[in-house]
């Protein structure tokens, strides 16, 4: 079939409205003016254009803005955003949080696509750092967003932004990421009192060093086993039986169920059996009485 290029008489679009859904692909191409489309982008979202029709509208905008769309158009892209490629998005300069929110709203219910990842990357780089409002917005749409960042990227998160982080936002973070986030959280929450501080810092404790865990054990925090199991093994090993008992409070009984799993298993191997026996939980595998424990790592450090 020969490609039809002339707009049929009486079909020239005077505005972007519902009547356009009856236009065939070639009619949209021929009868809709790109400049009109750009000024009435906000209407597109309310009209159930098919994928094929959205492709035509995108093509018209691409021709009008070969160097990338202006933010006034980007903000009103609506479902047309789903048709954009990461290459398209790299041409954009998105500075408004409202624009970001509008586009994330369009993608709601979908996984974080390469398009969204590129958009976020462009936005954050443009801002220079991941400020609190941006982080608030991103974690609201994508709870796992923070854990998708590299430790290097996380280092640009200012401590003030940590207030926006919810426990579920850290569910998929690995120890390397928590190592970066924990000091920021400690700084952010430093002026809170004991029990309030523990509630806030709890989700970040997978990055806490031994000395901080020792300090917490003096504050009657009653850490739950789920949190304890996420602690760094190297941070747990130096803790004494008495310190772990204080740290866990009534939850100490849960150690029995976890005695074969890290970090509990490794911690048990480092404790004297008679110290473990004082817990009355039947934990086995500690150092038998009368044995001398040499800390070879300390010896190496001294030599």
């Amino acid at each position: 079939e020969v490609e039809k290029t002339a707009c049929p008489s009486g079909k020239k679009a005077r505005e972007i409205d519902e009547s356009l859904i009856f236009y065939k692909k070639w009619e949209l191409e021929a009868c809709v003016d790109a400049a009109l489309l750009a000024t009435q982008m906000d209407r597109v979202n309310a009209i159930p254009f098919t994928y094929e029709q959205l492709d035509v509208l995108k093509h018209k905008l691409d021709e009008l803005y070969p160097q990338g769309y202006p933010e006034s158009v980007i903000q009103h892209l609506g479902y047309l955003f789903l048709k954009m490629s990461p290459e398209d998005i790299r041409k954009w300069n998105v500075t408004s949080l409202e624009t970001l929110k509008a586009l994330l709203e369009v993608n709601k219910g979908h996984e974080m696509s390469p398009q969204v990842a590129t958009l976020i990357d462009r936005f954050v780089k443009g801002r220079g750092q991941l400020d609190k409002d941006t982080l608030d917005t991103l974690t609201a749409f994508y709870p796992g967003y923070l854990c998708s960042l590299s430790p290097e990227e996380l280092s640009s998160v200012p401590p003030s932004s940590i207030w926006a982080v919810r426990p579920q936002d850290l569910d998929t973070c690995d120890p390397r990421q928590l190592d970066v986030l924990y000091p920021k959280a400690r700084l952010a929450f430093q002026n809170m009192n004991g029990s309030e501080y523990f509630v806030k810092i709890q989700s970040f404790l997978g990055g806490a060093p031994t000395e901080d865990l020792k300090a917490l054990s003096q504050q009657n925090v009653s850490m739950d086993l789920a949190t304890f199991m996420k602690l760094r093994t190297d941070a747990v090993l130096p803790l004494t039986v008495a310190e772990v008992q204080k740290l866990l409070g009534p939850h100490v009984e849960g150690l029995k169920a976890e005695e074969r799993h890290r970090p509990v298993r490794d911690w048990i191997l480092r404790q004297r059996q008679d110290d473990l026996d004082t817990l009355g939980l039947g934990l086995q595998g500690g150092i038998p009485n009368g044995y001398l424990v040499l800390d070879l790592s300390m010896q190496e450090a001294l030599s």
């Epitope: 009547s19 159930p48 098919t50 094929e52 029709q53």
Partner: antibody, heavy 120, light 106 residues
Framework: QVQLVESGGGLVKPGGSLRLSCAAS????????MSWIRQAPGKGLEWVSY????????YYADSVKGRFTISRDNAKNSLYLQMNSLRAEDTAVYYC?????????????WGQGTLVTVSS | IQLTQSPSSLSASVGDRVTITCRAS??????LAWYQQKPGKAPKLLIY???SLESGVPSRFSGSGSGTDFTLTISSLQPEDFATYYC?????????FGGGTKVEIK
């Protein structure tokens, strides 16, 4: 919860007329495009007609064009399908469905359906 | 655009992995939805945009594909999954449905 309930189906002779109704509840009816979809006995699904949220834009499948009329009353949260000049091949269960538009167009939820039988 | 589903029917047992295909007569990007219909009931949306799971739909259902070939997979068939499944394209008007695939108990 979101609910659609069709009524008005029945037995009608070829050439006769019938008016189907669909009562919507649990959502803002006036915000959504609505559709009629039919299913002949033992057969697949056929999209018959849809109407825009305001009622200003209407679509009909070629098989019913000129014989069926879709309309809506947003004040009553109701959708209608006026069927004239009925033929034996119009025999089907007729479903009303809410159009969901999120860059694509699909149907959710559907009503329980009303059976239209065209037979002499 | 015509959608052809295959097979038109299949027999399977509880716990089986079931795959249904839908082929479009021309490329439709990812503009495809899947529905489940039980006897005497209305169709129910399972998947949209070829692979996005509708909320409330069990994760054993998954969709894949782009262009002309699409697949609905049920990873471990449950008793309540015995039904007829339809695909629907929304790449261009008129919106069309596949002929359906009936999943029966072996």
């Amino acid at each position: 919860q979101v609910q659609l309930v069709e009524s008005g189906g029945g037995l009608v002779k070829p050439g006769g007329s019938l008016r189907l109704s669909c009562a919507a509840s649990g959502f803002t009816f006036s915000d959504y495009y609505m559709s009629w979809i039919r299913q002949a006995p033992g057969k697949g699904l056929e999209w018959v007609s849809y109407i825009s949220s305001s009622g200003s834009t209407i679509y009909y499948a070629d098989s019913v064009k000129g014989r069926f009329t879709i309309s809506r009353d947003n004040a009553k949260n109701s959708l209608y399908l006026q069927m004239n000049s009925l033929r034996a091949e119009d025999t089907a269960v007729y479903y009303c469905a809410r159009n969901i538009y999120m860059g694509g167009i699909w149907f959710d939820p559907w009503g329980q359906g009303t059976l239209v039988t065209v037979s002499s | 655009i015509q959608l052809t589903q295959s097979p038109s029917s299949l027999s399977a047992s509880v716990g089986d992995r079931v795959t249904i295909t839908c082929r479009a007569s021309q490329g439709i990007s990812s503009a495809l939805a899947w529905y489940q219909q039980k006897p005497g009931k209305a169709p129910k949306l399972l998947i949209y945009d070829a692979s996005s799971l509708e909320s409330g739909v069990p994760s054993r259902f998954s969709g894949s594909g782009s262009g002309t070939d699409f697949t609905l997979t049920i990873s471990s068939l449950q008793p309540e999954d015995f039904a007829t499944y339809y695909c629907q394209q929304f790449n261009s008007y008129p919106l069309t449905f596949g002929g359906g695939t009936k999943v029966e108990i072996k």
